[in-house]
């Protein structure tokens, strides 16, 4: 199911329903209640890219 994209002017007039699925390069931003471009992390030691897991100590990549 795609992300809901309600064309409403004010965020506070939209409902705050459960996050919907976003495409692979996006994630759900609760602040704007929509899918946004999302960057991946890499571990400083290995350089491996990963989705951020709770409790890990990863740093974001420089820039975008």
């Amino acid at each position: 199911m795609g992300a809901r994209r309600l064309r409403v002017r004010s965020q506070r007039s939209r409902d705050s329903s459960v996050p919907t699925q976003c495409n692979q390069t996006e994630c759900f931003d609760p602040l704007v209640r929509n899918c946004v471009s999302c960057e991946l992390f890499h571990t400083p030691d290995t350089g491996h890219t990963s989705s951020l897991e709770p409790g890990t100590a990863l740093q974001p990549q420089e820039g975008s």
Epitope: R9, C27, F28, P30, V32
Partner: antibody, heavy 125, light 107 residues
């Protein structure tokens, strides 16, 4: 290199209008939310408004709602803040900022990672 | 709107001191809290996001913790360049709101 450059600030009389611009380079504004944050002289940071250019969503602080309008032109990679009915209490340095998101199990973990240099708006008679 | 209450509003410390700043949200914001450093006449800089993740290029002496309503920024060993004002901000629910700031001054 990511960069945000504000312009359009200046001295305006109470009740007047100004339009601030935030020109972005090094990234595409349609992929992020763009925020305006202000700081009155000697005071703390106050969030003003955000726009999500990809879909046109916006939100405003109660203190500016109905007077300020945030917008974005993705073809120019620029965000704007139209300020009408300006008051003395709107006097501040206005910053634009990009919200970056990192993927935390499909949900954004983020913050405002790049900020402009700020533009001073002075409302005085 | 969610209120973010920072304490203390100012503190005096010496180089090498461990400094702790706290931020309390008026309602649950999960871990959607960022911390910023600002020096006079300059734009804020992102230090910590998602409550505990160090932004790229930020020295490891900075750390963040907390979830729900109570959050902490810690500077393990204060350096001369750390004297500045620090702000917390929640981004769980719009409007995003900042704390009132904590000014870290030289003792």
């Amino acid at each position: 290199e990511v960069q945000l450059v504000e312009s359009g600030g200046g001295l305006v009389q109470p009740g007047g209008s100004l339009r601030l611009s935030c020109a972005a380079s090094g990234f595409t504004i349609s992929s992020s939310s763009i925020h305006w944050v202000r700081q009155a002289p000697g005071k703390g940071l106050e969030w003003v408004a955000w726009v999500l250019p990809s879909v046109g969503f916006t939100d405003y602080a109660d203190s500016v709602k109905g007077r300020f309008t945030i917008s974005a032109d993705t073809s120019k990679n620029t965000a704007y803040l139209q300020m009408n009915s300006l008051r003395a209490e709107d006097t501040a340095v206005y910053y634009c900022a990009r919200r970056v998101c990192y993927n935390r199990l499909g949900v954004c973990a983020g913050g405002m990672d790049y900020w402009g240099q700020g533009t001073l708006v002075t409302v005085s008679s | 709107d969610i209120q973010m209450t920072q304490s203390p509003s100012s503190l005096s410390a010496s180089v090498g001191d461990r400094v702790t700043i706290t931020c309390r949200a008026s309602q649950d914001v999960a871990t959607a809290v960022a911390w910023y450093q600002q020096k006079p006449g300059k734009a804020p800089k992102l230090l910590i996001f998602a409550a505990s993740f160090l932004y790229s290029g930020v020295p490891s002496r900075f750390s963040g913790s907390g979830s729900g309503t109570d959050f902490t920024l810690t500077i393990s060993s204060l350096q001369p360049e750390d004297f500045a004002t620090y702000y917390c901000q929640q981004s769980q629910i719009s409007p995003p709101t900042f704390g009132q700031g904590t000014k870290v001054e030289i003792k």
